[in-house]
């Protein structure tokens, strides 16, 4: 996260840490007791590796009553998702169990209206990805808000060049941005998970490269047909 | 202690502009979004927009585009509005507000103290 | 826009009564604030995100509701709660206040 702070602490309950082999590799969000939503580019390159999911954590090396270390069960990318595209950048963990839920550890609504967030509308995104431009890798659960951005402006050829589609979303990222490591994390807004940080290695912070994130409306029926 | 301290009332004639301030003390100012709202007669409060003051991006309410202007001053911490073209629809309290937490439920934690714009010729 | 209408627009109760007053939005949210505003004062933020009361704010206060409809409640009335109360949207910009209920006291 780029010019953020860091976050009140277990008060994002949903929050997730998609670990590979005992080291912080993306965000993710708890969506259902048994179940992370994270970003499929997020798991490209862990094929041999060990990947779990933290919850109930804002340090990811201080012991803390909430924590825990999840297996997982079952990797699920979306089925069109692909190596070389930003598009369909969706995956659900299934937890080896059901999570422990508690103050700290709370799966996020999500939303399921297919409409796009309003520009302007100021979102909320969080994660343990880098904090400045050296590559810092923060302890704490770091936030910033953000503000939406219409597509069109995003779209545009010195921008992302007609690349955002209905399924994708745009946030400003005038030196406020999410950044590498924040990929698989939640944008909510009003509340309500309405992205998934796309996990592709967009430059940060240049206003001119605004973040992207998936519609997670878009993907409703996908989603629901996989928790099921 | 975080505060926002306003500047005083204005009276200002039509069609002319006003430039209020909301300096903001306790707080890092940077960090976090400034909004605007006006509350006329009949205590209706409308929501003009916002400005963050650690890039300048802000965005307004549709029915304020054109109306008014929102800018800051990082080495001050202080944000402004203007207000252009002035008609008796304008008079009103204007308010800074922010929000300093970092839950991800944020709301308008913090009021400047209101300014009065009176428009009258 | 999501515009949020308040009832009553006036509420008379004494003290130790139970009141509850109502926020209904035009379309859908997921949560709602609420500001309490006495005369010559700046708003103050009394309950944020439906039903967490902000700091300060006695527990004789409470909130609920979800989708359009929102309420507040105060358990057992006061003197110092006479106010105007306004319910708050920030699901979408832009972001809209009710036109807000005010609490006497007989």
């Known amino acids: 996260i780029l010019g953020g702070r860091e976050a009140e602490a277990h008060a994002r309950p949903y929050m997730a840490s998609v670990q590979l082999n005992g080291a912080h590799l993306c965000g993710g969000v708890l969506v259902a007791e048994q179940w992370v939503l994270s970003a499929a580019h997020c798991l490209e390159d862990a094929a041999d590796g060990k990947v779990q999911v933290l919850l109930g954590a804002h340090s990811l090396s201080q012991p803390e009553p909430s924590k825990r270390l999840y297996d997982v069960l079952r990797a699920v990318p979306h089925p069109d998702s692909q190596p070389d595209t930003i598009d369909h950048d969706l995956l659900l963990l299934q937890l080896s169990e059901k999570a422990t839920l508690g103050p700290a550890v709370r799966p996020l609504p999500w939303q399921r209206v297919d409409r796009d967030v309003a520009p302007g509308t100021l979102c909320d995104v969080a994660g343990w990805g880098i904090v400045n431009h050296a590559g810092r890798r923060p302890d704490s659960l770091q936030h910033v808000l953000l503000p939406v951005l219409d597509r069109a402006t995003c779209n545009r050829r010195t921008h992302h060049d007609g690349a955002i589609t209905e399924r994708l979303m745009c946030a400003e990222s005038n030196r406020r941005d999410s950044c590498k490591g924040d990929s698989g994390g939640p944008l909510v807004c009003g509340g309500v998970l309405e992205g998934v940080v796309t996990s592709g290695s967009r430059v940060c912070g240049n206003r001119k490269k605004p973040g992207i994130y998936t519609r997670v409306a878009s993907y409703a029926a996908w989603i629901d047909s996989v928790l099921a | 202690e975080v505060q926002l301290q306003q500047s005083g009332p204005e009276l200002v004639k039509p069609g002319a502009s006003v430039k209020i301030s909301c300096k903001a003390s306790g707080y890092s100012f940077t960090d976090y979004y400034m909004h605007w709202v006006k509350q006329s007669h009949g205590n209706i409060l409308d929501w003009i927009g916002y400005?963050?003051?650690?890039?300048?991006?802000?965005s307004y309410n549709q029915k304020f585009k054109g109306k008014a202007t929102l800018s800051v001053d990082q080495s001050s911490s202080t944000a402004y509005m203007e207000l252009r073209s002035l008609t008796s629809e304008d008079s009103a309290v204007y308010y800074c507000s922010s929000y300093y937490g970092s839950s991800p439920y944020w709301y308008f934690d913090v009021w400047g103290t209101g300014t009065r714009v009176t428009v009258s010729s | 826009q999501i515009v949020l209408s308040q009832s009553p627009a006036i509420l008379s109760a004494s003290p130790g009564e139970k009141v509850t007053m109502t926020c209904r939005a035009s379309s859908s949210v997921s949560y709602m604030h609420w500001y309490q505003q006495k005369p010559g004062s700046s708003p103050k933020p009394w309950i944020y995100?439906?039903?967490n009361l902000a700091s300060g704010v006695p527990t004789r206060f409470s909130g609920s509701g979800s989708g359009t409809s929102y309420s507040l409640t105060i358990s057992k009335l006061e003197a110092e709660d006479a106010a105007t109360y306004y319910c708050q949207q920030w699901s979408s910009n832009p972001y809209t206040f009710g036109g807000g209920t005010k609490l006497e006291i007989k």
């Open positions: 995100a439906t039903s």
């Open positions: 400005i963050d003051p650690y890039n300048g991006v802000s």
